[in-house]
């Protein structure tokens, strides 16, 4: 069945919220004054071989629970990210984009990235599927 | 009872080789990063770098980038310090220690007991 | 790198005094709101221990005789009642910028 614009609209929604999620998310550990950086950079990601389609997001999807873990280092009293609630919101997008009766392998690519190549690499991919859209 | 076990003390020539171990037990290993730091005889607390044992990512104070070698074998629940070539000046005690740093925090909760190297011809 | 400066450096003390101890930090430490500053005593031939995390939180099994203080550059530890076994040397550590870094230490001796 063809897209409709209203599920077009929903899906554009979908991944603007992602998008903002990751970005606050990268915006609030890539700070050369954040102390914990250094080490938060010691945690390695699986990066996708390839994310050109939303079903690409079950890289993500595989990836959240790691994710949850950095991002527990990262609080402070003026930076509620509050991890597990972030993650959920996260996830429920992704399953909703992707689709959850898919059952699509994730290809991981060799190498390991840190959290701010990771973030980046998504934050790339949702900006590109959402200028498709529009 | 969390706790991290070091290797025994070690007497070693200038130029040889030298890898110290940091066994940790009672806590899940790769959830926590583990921190080297020296005290030279007499002296204060130096910090030389960090591992990720889940990882294996690394992360080193610059003053002792190049001088030596931040591992972990998590199958073990071990990480080591090692150095290819050894100085009269390397003389120390070296502890490993546990990184706490989720929420508000970041400090060393458990330490090892420290293992005294000593570099003398 | 952030120094850190203790004062005293040492000094002789008997049991029952209030003792204070303070770090002074070239720059602040403090982040989004918290103090990256963390206190650790140290007895002869034995390994560093916690006793104050984020300037002022005691680690659990510190007695309460022990309490931390402070914020940007300056930091205190005190302790109400000098025990016996509190005769030790005493570090503040800065966790809040690469390399973290110790103070010099404060030798707390038996007058």
């Known amino acids: 069945m063809a897209p409709t614009s209203s599920s077009t609209k929903k899906t554009q929604l979908q991944l603007e919220h992602l998008l903002l999620d990751l970005q606050m998310i990268l915006n609030g550990i890539n700070n050369y004054k954040n102390p914990k950086l250094t080490r938060m950079l010691t945690f390695k990601f699986y990066m996708p071989k390839k994310a050109t389609e939303l079903k690409h997001l079950q890289c993500l999807e595989e990836e959240l629970k790691p994710l949850e873990e950095v991002l527990n280092l990262a609080q402070s009293k003026n930076f509620h990210l509050r991890p597990r609630d972030l993650i959920s919101n996260i996830n429920v997008i992704v399953l909703e984009l992707k689709g959850s009766e898919t059952t699509f392998m994730c290809e991981y690519a060799d190498e390991t990235a840190t959290i701010v190549e990771f973030l980046n690499r998504w934050i790339t991919f949702s900006q590109s599927i959402i200028s498709t859209l529009t | 009872e969390v706790q991290l076990v070091q290797s025994g003390a070690e007497v070693k020539k200038p130029g040889e080789s030298l890898k110290i171990s940091c066994k940790g037990s009672g806590y899940a290993f790769t959830n926590y990063l583990i921190e080297w730091v020296r005290q030279m005889p007499g002296k204060g607390l130096e910090w030389m770098g960090v591992?990720?044992?889940?990882?294996?990512?690394?992360y080193y104070n610059e003053k002792f980038k190049g001088q030596v070698t931040i591992s972990a074998d998590k199958s073990i629940s071990t990480a080591y310090l090692q150095w290819s070539s050894l100085k009269a000046s390397d003389t120390a005690m070296y502890y490993c220690a546990r990184w706490r740093g989720e929420g508000y925090y970041a400090y060393y909760d458990v330490w090892g007991q420290g293992t005294t190297v000593t570099v003398s011809s | 790198a952030i120094r850190l400066t203790q004062s005293p450096s040492s000094f002789s003390a008997s049991t029952g005094d209030r003792v204070t101890i303070t770090c002074k930090a070239s720059?602040?430490?403090?982040?989004?709101?918290?103090?990256?500053m963390n206190w650790y005593q140290q007895k002869p031939g034995k390994a560093p221990k916690l006793l104050i995390y984020?300037?002022?939180n005691l680690e659990s099994g510190v007695p309460s005789r022990f309490s931390g203080s402070g914020s940007g550059t300056d930091f205190t530890l005190t302790i109400s009642s000098l025990q016996s076994e509190d005769f030790a040397t005493y570090y503040c550590q800065q966790s809040n910028e690469d390399p973290y870094t110790f103070g010099g230490g404060t030798k707390v001796e038996i007058k």
């Open positions: 984020s300037a002022s």
């Open positions: 591992i990720n044992p889940g990882s294996g990512g690394t």
């Open positions: 720059q602040s430490v403090d982040y989004q709101g918290d103090s990256y």
